[in-house]
């Protein structure tokens, strides 16, 4: 006569996290008298799930009645899956017994793999502004993602990027993974529109990639160009000299006109114009009365941009 | 679906005696086989549990005396060393107790122990 | 081992009448849930009514009614028919397997 086996025909279930996960075990005889518990894991450490017998498992269903005479499903359902729960899962037949129950038998095994999509890529570029030219470096971070298999791309502006490096940890087994990739993009003057683009792959998002943007607007500054001109003479001994500041990015700019060394007048940028690649112009003038000079007069535009060291551009006013 | 049970009947103190049960309906290969006996005009008494080859057990009180054994349509009830207070109805009962109670019964055999 | 007492040993009622029984164990029962009740009429096998203390046996009427949980139970017939006239049986289970005892029946008389 046979005696009793525990079968779990599924040596793998794979789920999605969120969704319910379905572990079956039937036992061939009713004897011996003993519930039936199911493990996560297996020895000593082994983690109870289920326990026919007593106890409280909110997230575990029975698929069967338990109650009903002649029952030999001892299949489970657990809710609202996690990578978490990703593990070996045993069903174990006890026999009845005192002071405690008896292990009898145990199933092979079902390993259940949780399919867990990852986080929306973050994406994080250089704390300090650069110019054009500069190598400036970008990131970007997901997290939670399971099975490990995953596929990272860079793009600016629609085109891929080779130079990068990615890790995706931890190395070994886990519950869940996260991916970190690294970027180096060379800006351009051109980049005040520019978009990165970090775009991640996974089999839980069944073709359509996540992706993550940094605008270079963020990270670029494109320092100006200074042009000094003097206008023709005007009625009453003035003479107009301007200032064009040209093809800046941002805007916070300040400007201060010099007179032989000395401050005439300091503005901030406001009413600028913007160029179709997204950085600003603007222009500043100086009415200079040349009567009130006996001498050449050495007029200086000095344009303190976003910050940095001011740049100036010089002109000679002719006094005759 | 039913267990008919034979072999009771007239026995001498000391003697033995032999109590079978058949099945019809089901195999008792996945099913104990209980056995649950009535003294007259007593209540119920419980004896032990046919399981397979490896699982069977008595009460405190029949173990030694009574032995038990089934195959897939037949179980067994072997009694010895009989004495007066054994007389009583023997029921065969499939199940095993808590959740595989006992739902089908024989109609039971009467075994009487008198010199 | 377990020991079993059922009161009252009999019970006088009429047709129609909610009839309760109890049955009391000298500890928990295997589960807490370790108790069936059996009806047994004179010249007859027992019969399965409730087993887990409180789930009903296949085809049994719904008026029988199990309850109860670790060492007190209670079998309600909640409109006692003239066939449930009979005597009734607990059996309770300890955690050895082998400790199955009867309690000692109580007798359901006509009025």
């Known amino acids: 006569e046979e005696e009793l086996q525990v079968i779990q025909p599924d040596k793998s279930v794979l789920v999605a996290a969120g969704e319910t996960a379905t572990l079956r075990c039937t036992a061939t005889s009713l004897i011996p008298v003993g519930p039936i518990q199911w493990f996560r894991g297996a020895g000593p450490g082994r983690e109870l799930i289920y326990n026919q017998k007593e106890g409280h498992f909110p997230r575990v269903t029975t698929v069967s009645d338990l109650t009903k005479r002649n029952n030999m499903d001892f299949s489970i359902r657990i809710g609202n899956i996690t990578p978490a729960d990703a593990g070996t899962y045993y069903c174990v037949k006890f026999r009845k017994g005192s002071p405690d129950d008896v292990e009898f038998k145990s199933g092979a095994g079902t390993e259940l793999s949780v399919r867990a999509k990852p986080s929306a890529p973050v994406v994080s570029g250089p704390a300090a502004r650069a110019t054009p030219q500069h190598t400036v470096s970008f990131t970007c971070e997901s997290h939670g993602f399971s099975p490990r298999d995953i596929t990272l791309k860079w793009f600016k502006n629609g085109n891929e990027l080779s130079d990068f490096q990615t890790n995706v940890d931890p190395v070994g087994e886990s519950v869940s993974y996260s991916i970190h990739s690294t970027a180096k993009v060379v800006l351009t003057r051109e980049d005040v529109h520019s978009q990165v683009i970090c775009e991640v792959a996974h089999v839980t998002l069944q073709g359509d990639p996540l992706r993550g943007t940094a605008n270079l607007s963020e990270t670029i500054r494109v320092p100006p160009t200074l042009e000094v001109t003097q206008q023709p003479v005007r009625a009453e001994n003035q003479v107009n000299v301007t200032c064009q500041v040209r093809k800046f990015y941002p805007q916070r700019l300040q400007l201060t006109w010099l007179e032989n060394g000395n401050v005439s007048r300091t503005e901030t940028a406001s009413t600028v114009t913007e160029n179709k690649d997204g950085t600003y112009n603007w222009m500043s003038w100086l009415l200079v009365n040349v009567s009130a000079h006996r001498d050449d007069v050495k007029l200086t535009c000095q344009v303190e941009h976003d910050g940095q060291p001011a740049v100036s551009k010089s002109h000679d006013l002719k006094v005759s | 679906r039913q267990l008919v049970e034979s072999g009771g009947g007239l026995v001498q103190p000391g003697g033995s005696l032999r109590l079978s049960c058949a099945a019809s309906?089901?195999?008792?290969?996945?099913?104990?086989i209980s056995w649950v006996r009535q003294a007259p005009g007593k209540g119920l008494e419980y004896i032990g549990t046919?399981?397979?080859?490896?699982i069977t057990y008595y009460a405190s009180w029949a173990k030694g005396r009574f032995t038990g054994s089934k195959t897939s349509s037949t179980a067994y009830l072997q009694m010895t060393s009989l004495r007066a207070e054994d007389t009583a109805v023997y029921y065969c009962a499939r199940g095993s107790a808590w959740n595989d109670p006992f739902d089908y019964w024989g109609q039971g055999t009467l075994v009487t122990v008198s010199s | 081992d377990i020991e079993m007492t059922q009161s009252p040993s009999s019970v006088s009622a009429s047709v129609g009448d909610r009839v309760t029984l109890t049955c009391q164990a000298s500890?928990?029962?295997?589960?807490?849930?370790?108790l069936a009740w059996y009806q047994q009429k004179p010249g007859q096998a027992p019969k399965l009514l409730i087993y887990l203390a409180s789930t009903l046996a296949t085809g049994v009427p719904s008026r029988f009614s199990g309850s109860g949980s670790g060492t007190d139970f209670t079998l309600t017939i909640s409109s006692l028919q003239p066939e449930d006239f009979a005597t009734y049986y607990c059996?309770?289970?300890?955690?050895?397997?082998?400790?199955?005892?009867f309690g000692g029946g109580t007798k359901v008389e006509i009025k």
């Open positions: 309906g089901f195999s008792l290969s996945s099913h104990g």
């Open positions: 500890q928990s029962v295997y589960g807490n849930n370790d």
């Open positions: 059996l309770g289970g300890g955690d050895d397997e082998a400790d199955n005892v």
């Open positions: 046919i399981g397979t080859g490896v």
